[in-house]
């Protein structure tokens, strides 16, 4: 749906065209429940709360209302070269029995999070792939999104800034005749359990299958993309427990070290995968020592004490050269009782659609 905010002259300053899916974890008398629902087609802009920003004082905001008192707000900010959705907030009313059947509380909840939605000034933000924003007990996924703020006239700009997920990874060049052909696509990796314990007991439980999606330049100057499975039978796990950081270190086949770092948002009591580091050897690579890391991730999120679970394959974008494919994942960090997974928070893809 298209949403628009206009200034006093009738000129649009924000335009947004997207569909949105919400995944909300809430409590019922019989335990935690996850509901997944879409932004309905009759969702509307709340004109008296949306704004183009007042001179010198505030930034533009888009407030969208739907159902029985639910609102999704996008707050924009800018600098000299870029603008962004600095904050996304979602207010939902648990007394709406249509969306939240059997909710044990009838209160109005507010959750918010910073986002990765950003674009060059005078260009539209475009993201065909899903853009996920994780908040406390809520995940909002925007699909096929075109968003622009700080507009000059009531139309999207010609230029666009594409989201990271939409950008093509380097194309796989066909190998030169004398070179060995790329390895065949491996079957799904085996799922294994990993745990990390410290002085206060277990701080990480994980069950997952891991596959590395590597893109690199070979010695013959061709670019190749390879899928490598982490073989649990040839992998040893270690790690550390900290108040703010939990690490899982996997040593595989003597040549690969895969490090996971889980962080915690103290204010929302949620854990999330914040960092991945890979060190491996690729004998046919132009630079055989392959080292990649990203410490600003926000994946595999759940409330501390609960576990994150996703049956469908998840792709975690680490860099243009590395994506991690995670199969049948269930993970719980920081607080693990009795060495067992807690209540499940399912990923959006697994949620029961209404």
């Amino acid at each position: 749906a298209m949403f628009m905010v206009k200034n006093g002259n009738g000129t649009a300053c924000i335009m947004a065209n997207f569909s949105a899916a919400f995944s909300v974890n809430y409590d019922t008398k019989s335990g935690p429940k996850n509901m997944t629902f879409d932004l309905p087609s009759d969702a509307t802009v709340v004109l008296n709360r949306s704004s183009c920003g007042k001179e010198n004082t505030s930034d533009p905001s888009l407030v969208i209302a739907f159902g029985r008192g639910h609102t999704l707000t996008l707050n924009f900010t800018r600098n000299a070269t870029r603008y962004s959705v600095q904050l996304m907030s979602f207010v939902y009313n648990l007394s709406d029995t249509h969306l939240f059947p059997n909710a044990s509380s009838k209160e109005i909840k507010t959750v918010e999070s910073i986002t990765d939605i950003r674009a060059d000034i005078d260009k539209k933000y475009r993201c065909v792939s899903g853009t996920q924003v994780h908040m406390n007990n809520v995940t909002v996924t925007l699909h096929d999104a075109t968003i622009q703020a700080y507009l000059s006239n009531s139309s999207f700009s010609r230029g666009e800034t594409r989201c990271e997920q939409d950008r093509p990874s380097p194309t796989t060049a066909p190998p030169a005749p004398p070179s060995p052909s790329p390895s065949p696509v491996p079957k799904s990796p085996s799922v294994d359990k990993y745990n990390v314990s410290g002085t206060n007991g277990t701080c990480l439980l994980a069950s997952m299958g891991l596959q590395l999606n590597l893109t690199y330049e070979r010695k013959d100057n061709t670019t190749v993309t390879r899928l490598l499975n982490i073989n649990p039978n040839k992998t040893s796990a270690s790690g550390s427990c900290g108040a703010h950081l939990v690490t899982l270190e996997l040593h595989s086949e003597g040549t690969t070290v895969l490090l996971f770092q889980f962080g915690m948002n103290a204010s929302s009591s949620r854990f999330f995968l914040q960092g991945i580091q890979l060190n491996t050897i690729l004998p046919d690579a132009l630079v055989p020592t392959f080292s990649i890391s990203n410490h600003s991730l926000k994946a595999l999120q759940a409330t501390v004490g609960n576990s994150y679970k996703c049956n469908t394959e998840e792709h975690i974008f680490v860099s243009k050269m590395l994506s991690l494919n995670v199969f049948s994942v269930q993970v719980q960090a920081f607080k693990v009782d009795s060495d067992r997974f807690g209540s499940v928070e399912e990923c959006v893809q697994d949620g029961n659609s209404m």
Partner: antibody, heavy 118, light 106 residues
């Protein structure tokens, strides 16, 4: 209508600093970047940097990042550029410029002539 | 910073004739290209933006084209008041001017 009024010509000694101003009118000052452009006989037009008056964010050209400092005063709708450690190479006309959204540099001040001489 | 290579640095042409100036960017600038006319004692004047869109009041003798990294600017039916220095400007990623082309009439 949009107007950019620049301060007068400056004659300065080598090694000194100079600070020039650009007062904007006819539009909401915090809605647009103000750019600074150098015009010299030897080098032609060169983009120095820009400032977004809303929060003072200022990207610079690599060449000028140690030479120029851009600031903005929202209360007076005025942007300033200070040039430091002046040499004869800095003798030029300096323009403040405003873009018209995605229509590049549409509005130009009248220019400030800086002459560096012992 | 994106580099802009403008050529030729100077050119001479006859009244009524046509001239073409080119600019090459160090990377794709997605048609975010403008052209300026600069006369001594005056501020630069925007002629074309978005590669080929003429500013209001600019005669249709001026034109621009290009895509990717390569752009060109032409003046046909040259008139005496066209004597000036012309600059390209990319504004896709920060802002960079070309080195300028000084136009003289034979």
């Amino acid at each position: 209508q949009v107007q950019l009024q620049q301060s007068g010509a400056e004659l300065v000694k080598p090694g000194a600093s100079v600070k020039m101003s650009c007062k904007a009118s006819g539009y909401i000052f915090t809605n647009y970047n103000i750019h600074w452009v150098k015009k010299s006989p030897g080098q032609g037009l060169e983009w120095i940097g820009a400032i977004y008056p809303g929060n003072g964010d200022a990207p610079y050209s690599q060449k000028f990042k140690d030479k120029a400092t851009l600031t903005a005063d929202k209360s007076s709708s005025t942007t300033y550029m200070q040039l430091s450690r002046l040499t004869s190479e800095d003798s030029a006309v300096y323009y403040c410029v405003r873009a018209n959204w995605d229509v590049a540099f549409a509005y130009w001040g009248q220019g400030t002539l800086v002459s560096v001489s012992a | 910073d994106i580099q802009m290579t403008q050529s030729p640095p100077s050119l001479s042409a006859s009244l009524g004739g046509k001239v073409t100036i080119t600019c090459k960017a160090s990377q794709d600038i997605d048609r975010y290209m403008a052209w300026y006319q600069d006369k001594p004692g005056k501020g630069p004047r925007l002629l074309i933006h978005d590669t080929s869109t003429l500013q209001p009041g600019i005669p249709s003798r001026f034109s621009g084209s290009g895509s990717g990294r390569d752009y060109s600017f032409s003046i046909s039916n040259l008139e005496p008041e066209d004597i000036a220095t012309y600059y390209c400007l990319q504004y896709d990623n920060l802002w960079t001017f070309g080195g300028g082309t000084k136009l003289e009439i034979k």
